[in-house]
Interface confidence: low
């Protein structure tokens, strides 16, 4: 007698490993023999699909080599024309040993930055990811964390983070290890010991000493007055990531010597600089060289002192005038650390405006000297004691240099603002009138040696700061 199909063994959930065989059984009783069809996620599985084997009149579906994409709901449907079609469904869960799909790679990172070592995994059940540094499991802390993705994130990378890392992916079916990768921590070049300034007699031998560190170990180069050192012998030694460079010089002229430590990070370089002056006792200064050009000040040391957007004179007797003059100021400012709080701002203003003189924007750029009145104000009022010391040092040759900019200006030789208001530059930071003169404590018990003329107040219109110009 005809009998409608009945599925006697309903489909069950099947667990299968990748690349293994998975079989669904759909046992049917019926008469006549039914037609059995199979679907995956409601899409018909074609009889000629070579990834599957359908046997036992359709009752047995075998996936010959399971892939992770075979996950899904498999249904068999039996129909023989008697009664309705019947269906049974079961799930295929693809189980997978851990697999590292995006392994970590070697990383070079600069100290203080954030490093991320990738470790993306696959697997079912989802693998847990841990990391090994060297031979020991890596412990997480406030800086070091294993992300949800499995990647290792290290904030504020330190030198001690450098080393060999590998990630480990683990689930109930097995364990996968990445290859070992190297985290290299690079450190910007830094000068540990700066060269010291010297005042020596003509024909002396002087050794300038500069020590620097960094990862990779920096190279040290020496610059003389803005150009590569042309004479002198250099001895170098490297120990424990510290480079020690000694420049021995036979002194026949004064100079500004700069030690430059450089190391490379990929395509970029980091540099650290320190400068020392060599001055010669009884050295007669050459005539002031007015060869140069005008530009906006772009340095740092005199930022707060120089008038905003003022054009300053840059002396092309240096290969890199901005840098050389900036180093001159930097070196001189270090000398000012010991002066009184009243003197210091005045001396800084004088120094910055003397080294970065205001520019006369003519066809041939020339520097505008500081007005005599402002120079005298610093000398006789703000810095009386300190000036005596500076003049003493000047007489002993400590400030004497081929680079005239290092010397203290001689106030008496500067033009007065009463002669030609445009022929000299004011120091806006020192503008004062009779009233606020009283606010400054006396520098010395003795009376100033010259009468300091009234300087205009900042509100005075008769002596406004000369305009700035743009060069075309």
């Amino acid at each position: 007698l005809p009998k409608a199909p009945v599925i006697t063994t309903p489909l069950e959930t099947v667990d299968a490993l990748v690349e293994e065989v998975a079989t669904f059984m759909c046992a049917v009783e019926s008469y006549p023999q039914p037609e059995i069809s199979w679907t995956r996620n409601k899409i018909l599985i074609k009889l000629f699909d070579t990834r599957y084997s359908i046997r036992e009149n359709g009752q047995l579906l075998t996936i010959l080599s399971v892939e992770d994409s075979d996950d899904g709901i498999y249904c068999c449907t039996a129909n023989n024309g008697v009664g309705g079609a019947v269906e049974s469904c079961g799930a295929l869960q693809v189980k997978m040993k851990p697999k590292i799909t995006r392994p970590p790679i070697n990383v070079k990172i600069i100290e203080g930055l954030k490093a991320v070592l990738p470790c993306t995994t696959m697997g079912n059940p989802k693998p847990s990811v841990s990391w090994i540094k060297g031979d020991s499991p890596l412990r997480e802390n406030s800086r070091i964390a294993v992300l949800e993705s499995g990647s290792l994130r290290i904030h504020n990378v330190q030198k001690e983070d450098a080393g060999q890392y590998r990630c480990v992916a683990k689930n109930s079916l097995g364990t996968a290890y990445s290859k070992v990768v190297k985290l290299e921590v690079e450190v910007f070049a830094r000068i540990l010991r700066a060269p010291e300034s010297h005042n020596v007699t003509f024909g002396s031998f002087v050794t300038l000493h500069c020590t620097a560190t960094g990862i990779p170990v920096p190279t040290i180069t020496w610059i003389e007055n803005g150009n590569a050192v042309s004479s002198g012998s250099i001895q170098e030694s490297v120990k424990d990531r510290v480079i020690d460079s000694r420049l021995q010089l036979f002194i026949t002229k004064p100079g500004l010597y700069t030690c430059i430590a450089t190391n490379k990070h990929g395509e970029k370089f980091s540099t650290a600089k320190a400068a020392a002056t060599i001055s010669i006792a009884e050295w007669s200064k050459p005539q002031k060289d007015n060869k140069g050009y005008c530009a906006q000040y772009r340095g740092e040391v005199c930022n707060a002192v120089l008038a905003k957007d003022a054009l300053v004179f840059l002396n092309t007797s240096y290969a890199d005038p901005e840098e050389a003059q900036e180093l001159l100021v930097h070196t001189a400012w270090n000398e000012l650390k010991v002066v009184s709080p009243v003197c210091r701002p005045a001396a800084e203003a004088l120094l910055c405006n003397h080294i970065f003189q205001e520019c006369s924007p003519g066809v041939v750029p020339t520097p505008i000297p500081i007005c005599r009145e402002y120079c005298l104000a610093v000398k006789e009022l703000f810095c009386a004691k300190e000036w005596l010391v500076m003049e003493e040092k000047t007489h002993r040759g400590l400030y004497r240099s081929e680079m005239h900019l290092l010397s203290v200006p001689e106030c008496s030789k500067l033009p007065s603002m009463h002669w030609d208001p445009t022929a000299c530059a004011r120091l806006p930071h020192l503008d004062y009138n009779k009233e606020n003169l009283k606010t400054f404590p006396p520098m010395t018990s003795s009376k100033p040696s010259v009468d300091i003329p009234n300087l205009p107040s900042s509100s005075s219109s008769s002596f406004s700061v000369s305009p700035t110009y743009s060069m075309t």
């Epitope: 803005g226 150009n227 590569a228 050009y293 092309t316 290969a319 743009s470 060069m471 075309t472």
Partner: antibody
Framework: QVQVQESGPGLVKPSQTLSLTCTVS??????????WSWIRQPPGKGLEWMGV???????YYSPSLKSRTSISRDTSKNQFSLHLSSVTPDDTAVYYC?????????????WGQGTQVTVSS | SYELTQSPSVSVALRQTAKITCGGD??????AQWYQQKPGQAPVMVLY???RRPSGIPERFSGSNSGNTATLTISGAQAEDEADYYC??????????FGGGTHLTVL
């Protein structure tokens, strides 16, 4: 990525003025830290710098060509132009426009493909 | 005017080191640039500021500059390095100067 492209006549008669235009895309000609130069290369010879216009419009010219050279710009079109007067057959060359960048010590980091100019009657 | 002198040609065996020099009065006090030019193409910057390599330029290109000579060094020259090489500096009057060019032949 900035791109520069020269355009202009390929043939100029002697004694006339040669005018070429360089169109800049992917960056402004008024951007600080960049300057815009004209450089030429006669057939079989080396490179010769002709002049430059800075971001602020100031111009500088090669001493040997100064009397005949003028560089101007049209900021609305992001173009700069070369005018070379009183040309002779010696001015036959491939003319390049190029960007100079302070970030690379004023080296020319972007060049046009060059335009061939022949001076002939 | 400022003159930059380059030798017209230099030959180097494949994978050997080539040195191309550029002479100029006190060139060491200036930034030297180097450009590579292949036939029918525009020049390409290979070094700037004496020894800095732009991204995309192989590590075999290096440079130095002191005294009166700037040098471009190609360590382990490849066939594709065969080209003309030009040095370039700016002077203090905002004039740019090119050397006459050196043709590098890779044997």
């Amino acid at each position: 990525q900035v791109q520069v492209q020269e355009s202009g006549p390929g043939l100029v008669k002697p004694s006339q003025t040669l005018s070429l235009t360089c169109t800049v895309s992917g960056g402004s000609i008024t951007a600080r830290y960049y300057s815009w130069s004209w450089i030429r290369q006669p057939p079989g010879k080396g490179l010769e710098w002709m002049g430059v216009i800075a971001y602020d419009g100031s111009t500088y010219y090669s001493p040997s060509l100064k009397s005949r050279t003028s560089i101007s710009r049209d900021t609305s079109k992001n173009q700069f132009s070369l005018h070379l007067s009183s040309v002779t057959p010696d001015d036959t060359a491939v003319y390049y426009c190029a960007r100079g960048s302070s970030r690379v010590a004023a080296a020319f980091d972007s060049w046009g493909q060059g335009t061939q100019v022949t001076v002939s009657s | 005017s400022y003159e930059l002198t380059q030798s017209p040609s230099v030959s180097v065996a494949l994978r050997q080191t080539a040195k191309i020099t550029c002479g100029g009065d006190n060139i060491g006090s200036k930034n030297a640039q180097w450009y590579q030019q292949k036939p029918g193409q525009a020049p390409v910057m290979v070094l700037y500021a004496d020894s800095r390599r732009p991204s995309g330029i192989p590590e075999r290109f290096s440079g130095s500059n002191s005294g009166n000579t700037a040098t471009l060094t190609i360590s382990g020259a490849q066939a594709e390095d065969e080209a003309d090489y030009y040095c370039h500096v700016w002077d203090s009057s905002t004039n740019a100067w090119f050397g006459g060019g050196t043709h590098l032949t890779v044997l």
